[in-house]
Interface confidence: medium
C-alpha cells in the first residue's frame, strides 16, 4: 500500500508515534517519506547482504528475520515480511523498539539526512488529526 501523507500521519498517530521518545509526528512522516516514499512494500538491499523492509525501511541485520541475513539479531522478533503489510502495526511496534535503542531517530539515515533540523511539522500541516 502507498499511503497518502495525511493518511499515514493519522495512522501513525493512532499507533502512538506522536511524540514517542520525544519525536513529534512530523518526524515520523518525514522519515517514511524519504525512506520508502510512503510505500509499505518497499524493499532495498544493502551492500552488507542485509535488506531494509517496509515503510520505515527496517533492517534485517538487526531488527527482523528474513531467513537469509547472516548473523541476524531479529531484535523485534518478527519476520521481515510482516513489515510489508498494509497494516503498519508491526512496523510501528518495531520502530518504537529501534528509537528506544539509544540513537533515537538517528538510526534512520534518511531522517538524519533529510528531516533532522528541518521544519518537520510541514509534513502534517493541513492534516485533520
Amino acid at each position: 500500500k502507498v499511503f497518502g501523507r495525511c493518511e499515514l500521519a493519522a495512522a501513525m498517530k493512532r499507533h502512538g508515534l506522536d511524540n514517542y521518545r520525544g519525536y513529534s509526528l512530523g518526524n515520523w512522516v518525514c522519515a517514511a517519506k524519504f525512506e520508502s516514499n510512503f510505500n509499505t512494500q518497499a524493499t532495498n538491499r544493502n551492500t552488507d547482504g542485509s535488506t531494509d523492509y517496509g515503510i520505515l525501511q527496517i533492517n534485517s541485520r538487526w531488527w527482523c528475520n528474513d531467513g537469509r541475513t547472516p548473523g541476524s539479531r531479529n531484535l523485534c522478533n518478527i519476520p521481515c515480511s510482516a513489515l510489508l503489510s498494509s497494516d503498519i502495526t508491526a512496523s510501528v511496534n518495531c520502530a518504537k523498539k529501534i528509537v528506544s535503542d539509544g540513537n533515537g531517530m538517528n538510526a534512520w539515515v534518511a531522517w538524519r539526512n533529510r528531516c533532522k533540523g528541518t521544519d518537520v511539522q510541514a509534513w502534517i500541516r493541513g492534516c485533520r488529526l
Epitope: Q41, T47, G49, D66, G67, R68, P70, P79, S81, L84
Partner: antibody
Framework: QVQLQESGAEVMKPGASVKISCKAT????????IEWVKQRPGHGLEWIGE????????YYNEKFKGKATFTADTSSNTAYMQLSSLTSEDSAVYYC?????????WGQGTTLTVS | DIELTQSPATLSVTPGDSVSLSCRAS??????LHWYQQKPHESPRLLIK???QSMSGIPSRFSGSGSGTDFTLSINSVETEDFGMYFC?????????FGGGTKLEIK
C-alpha cells in the same frame, strides 16, 4: 516438510513466451524469498533473480532484465517465472529455490527446450 | 559482480582418497560462501553453509574452511556416492553468483 514442486518440461518455438511455476508447501510462503536459477550444460548455475511473495518485491540479475518476469499467487502458494522472446540460448533447466542466503530447498527443475 | 573461480575443473580420484576443492572469490565475501553437490539429473544439494557449517544429514567426511577470498571443501576418504559436480555460491552481495564447478570423477 518444505517442498518446491515445479511445472513439467516445455518445448517452445523461438520468439514465444513460457511461464514456469513453482508451488511451495510446508512453510509460510509469504515470508521467504523465492529465487530462480538457470543451468545450462557448460555454463554452470546462474542466478536470475528473486521475488518476495508477500509483497511482490522483485530483484533481477541485470543479465535477465527484460527476459524474465516474476510473479506470485499467495492464494495458491505458487511463484511463477515468465520468459519472453525465447531463443536457443534460453534452453536450460530452470530451478526455483527458497532464498535463505544459501539454497537448502530446491525444486526438481523444469527443462525448457527452444527449438 | 563477484566472480567465483573453482579449481581444479576436474578431479580424478580413487575411493578412499582424501581431496580438497578450492573456490576463490574476486573480492572478500567474509564467510558468506556455500557448497553444493549435484548428481546428473538432480537438483543441487547443500553440503556446507557459511564457509564451514555442515548441514544436518550430510556425512561428516565433508568439511568446509576459509574466509575472505579463499575457501576449501574437503572430503575425507571419498566414497563412490560422492562422485558428481561440486559448486560454490556466494551470498555476500547481489547478484548471487556460483562457481563454474569441479567435477569429481572416478580414476
Amino acid at each position: 516438510q518444505v517442498q518446491l514442486q515445479e511445472s513439467g518440461a516445455e518445448v517452445m518455438k523461438p520468439g514465444a513466451s513460457v511461464k514456469i511455476s513453482c508451488k511451495a508447501t510446508g512453510y509460510t510462503f509469504t515470508t521467504y524469498w523465492i529465487e530462480w536459477v538457470k543451468q545450462r550444460p557448460g555454463h554452470g548455475l546462474e542466478w536470475i533473480g528473486e521475488i518476495l511473495p508477500g509483497s511482490g518485491s522483485t530483484y533481477y540479475n541485470e543479465k535477465f532484465k527484460g527476459k524474465a518476469t516474476f510473479t506470485a499467487d499467495t492464494s495458491s502458494n505458487t511463484a511463477y517465472m515468465q520468459l519472453s522472446s525465447l531463443t536457443s540460448e534460453d534452453s536450460a533447466v530452470y530451478y526455483c529455490a527458497r532464498g535463505d542466503g544459501n539454497y537448502y530447498y530446491w525444486g526438481q527443475g523444469t527443462t525448457l527446450t527452444v527449438s | 559482480d563477484i566472480e567465483l573461480t573453482q579449481s581444479p575443473a576436474t578431479l580424478s580420484v580413487t575411493p578412499g582418497d582424501s581431496v580438497s576443492l578450492s573456490c576463490r572469490a574476486s573480492q572478500s565475501i567474509s564467510n558468506n560462501l556455500h557448497w553444493y553437490q549435484q548428481k546428473p539429473h538432480e537438483s543441487p544439494r547443500l553440503l556446507i553453509k557459511y564457509g564451514s557449517q555442515s548441514m544436518s544429514g550430510i556425512p561428516s567426511r565433508f568439511s568446509g574452511s576459509g574466509s575472505g577470498t579463499d575457501f576449501t571443501l574437503s572430503i575425507n576418504s571419498v566414497e563412490t556416492e560422492d562422485f558428481g559436480m561440486y559448486f560454490c555460491q556466494q551470498s555476500n552481495s547481489w547478484p548471487r553468483t556460483f562457481g563454474g564447478g569441479t567435477k569429481l570423477e572416478i580414476k
